[in-house]
């Protein structure tokens, strides 16, 4: 999958764009909005109705390196009087996010834009019944 | 810094910490080969806590095209069907990681960003303060 | 066609404990749960508890919570039962079933049955 | 927890007949599955949902009821039949069974 040139005609390459060379891109690290914080929406992980764990996942060549996935809890979800309700599913939501990867080849090094997938909660789904005719 | 093992051989000039600009391939390697993304596709209208999806489009981002979740309701669907106001719907938000042209309008120089998405939502009890 | 292959029998001492396997193939393994019930000597199918490999949900009949633990190798496409403290009563025929893949069907929906695995527990 | 009681226990009955199997549960379920278990054998997948026939089922089988008393038909017994029946749902945790009704071919 490769990244898409800027496709608008409004848009002219600036003179101030840095040479690249082909097949590849200059890509800068220093996150924009890295001091950005979530306001932790007061662990909702432990009050939804198909609550979920958090685990961080560690690889070094990886930027950035730490990966927080959420794995839900249960299968079903969990009703008014605190049991699990299993005529409903806990379902994890997932989102895509970019990371660099670090590729040691021989005594080169070289980077990769990986996509992954990140499952951030879970949510309670009522699943398809499909009734016969 | 982190450690990374590295051939004996090799000159030990490297820092052992990403740096700061690098050059990436154009093309981007994709972990998700198994998952299956229609499964998932409709979890919005199923959901206890459903919600829509708006585009958010910039095409200084890559990638361009970004969903963002907006719960339906304030409360939570209960098993007739209504809306039950003793629970919440609550949106569930994940930094992302994205690249943003720069200088802007360049095709082949970008820097990484941290944005902030509602991805889906979820149904809560609330937190009752009792009065002492 | 779906498969699920389980160990083979065990003999153990009391206060032991004991894993079973089962490999999953004919199927996308993360996309289905997978549960795990017990049948005692003539006696009725008891549900232990299931599994979901892809979000790690777990579910567990209250009567096996400290006495199994189900657990995953998505890599393997295999999942685990292990019992533990292993007592006489424990003494039985184990199956790994599949369940339902919460999109198309609910996850407690049980289609395809392992051969099942027998674990004695004897002094 | 749903307790499931099958009735009877037991049956002996003749090829060609027809085989009623009930399954009365201590609270409303929405569904039920029925399995069979032939000798040395794991248990197999009969109907889902009530009424709905696995794939591979032959059509003598059939299923119904509704609220607490459910009901597998077998329309034209076989001998291949004999086998334990169970009774299943997954409406209300834990998922459970019924205690089996063990059909013996004459």
């Known amino acids: 999958r490769k990244i898409p040139k800027v496709g608008h005609t409004f848009f002219q390459k600036p003179e101030s764009c840095p040479p690249v060379p082909g097949g590849s891109m200059k890509l800068d690290i220093g996150i924009i909005n890295e001091n950005q914080r979530v306001s932790m929406s007061r662990n909702i992980e432990s009050r939804s109705t198909s609550p979920w764990n958090y685990t961080v996942t560690w690889d070094p060549n990886r930027y950035p390196s730490e990966v927080v996935q959420a794995q839900c809890r249960n299968l079903g979800c969990i009703n008014a009087q605190g049991k699990e309700d299993i005529s409903m599913n806990s379902v994890p939501i997932q989102q895509e996010t970019l990371v660099v990867r670090r590729k040691h080849q021989g005594c080169s090094v070289s980077f990769q834009l990986e996509k992954v997938l990140v499952t951030v909660g879970c949510t309670c789904v009522t699943p398809v019944i499909h009734h016969v005719q | 810094g982190i450690t990374i093992p590295r051939n004996p051989g090799c000159p030990n000039s490297e820092d052992k910490n990403f740096p700061r600009t690098v050059m990436v391939n154009l093309n981007i390697h994709n972990r998700n080969t198994n998952t299956n993304p229609k499964r998932s596709s409709d979890y919005y209208n199923r959901s206890t806590s459903p919600w829509n999806l708006h585009r958010n489009e910039d095409p200084e981002r890559y990638p361009s095209v970004i969903w963002e979740a907006k719960c339906r309701h304030l409360g939570c669907i209960n098993a007739d069907g209504n809306v039950d106001y003793h629970m919440n719907s609550v949106p569930i938000q994940q930094e992302i990681l994205v690249l943003r042209r720069e200088p802007p309008h360049c095709p082949n120089s970008f820097r990484l960003e941290k944005i902030l998405v509602s991805v889906g939502c979820t149904c809560v009890t609330p937190i009752v303060h009792h009065v002492a | 066609q779906v498969q699920l292959v389980q160990s083979g029998a065990e003999v153990k001492k009391p206060g032991a404990s004991v894993k079973v396997s089962c490999k999953a193939s004919?199927?996308?393994?993360?996309?289905?749960?997978m549960h795990w019930v017990k049948q005692s000597h003539g006696q009725r199918l008891e549900w232990m508890g299931g599994?979901?490999?892809?979000?790690?949900?777990?579910s567990y009949n209250q009567n096996f919570k400290g006495k199994a633990t189900l657990t995953v190798d998505t890599s393997a496409s295999t999942a685990y039962m292990e019992l533990s403290s292993l007592r006489s009563e424990d003494t039985a025929v184990y199956y790994c079933?599949?369940?339902?893949?919460?999109?198309?069907?609910?996850?407690?929906?049980?289609?395809?049955w392992g051969q099942g695995t027998t674990v004695t527990v004897s002094s | 927890e749903i307790v499931l009681t099958q009735s009877p226990d037991f049956q002996s009955v003749t090829p060609k007949e027809k085989v009623t199997i009930t399954c009365s549960a201590s609270?409303?379920?929405?569904?039920m599955h029925w399995y069979q278990q032939k000798p040395d054998q794991s248990p197999k997948l009969l109907i889902k949902?009530?009424?709905k026939l696995a794939s591979g089922v032959p059509s003598r089988f059939s299923g119904s009821g509704s609220g607490t008393d459910f009901t597998l038909t077998i329309n034209s017994l076989e001998a291949e039949d004999a086998a334990t029946y169970y009774c299943?749902?997954?409406?209300?945790?834990?998922?459970?069974f019924g205690q089996g009704t063990k059909l013996e071919i004459k």
């Open positions: 079933a599949r369940g339902g893949d919460g999109y198309y069907t609910n996850y407690f929906d049980i289609d395809y």
């Open positions: 004919g199927y996308t393994f993360n996309e289905y749960t």
């Open positions: 599994i979901n490999p892809n979000s790690g949900g777990v």
């Open positions: 609270s409303s379920v929405n569904y």
């Open positions: 949902d009530t009424s």
């Open positions: 299943q749902q997954w409406n209300s945790h834990p998922l459970t």
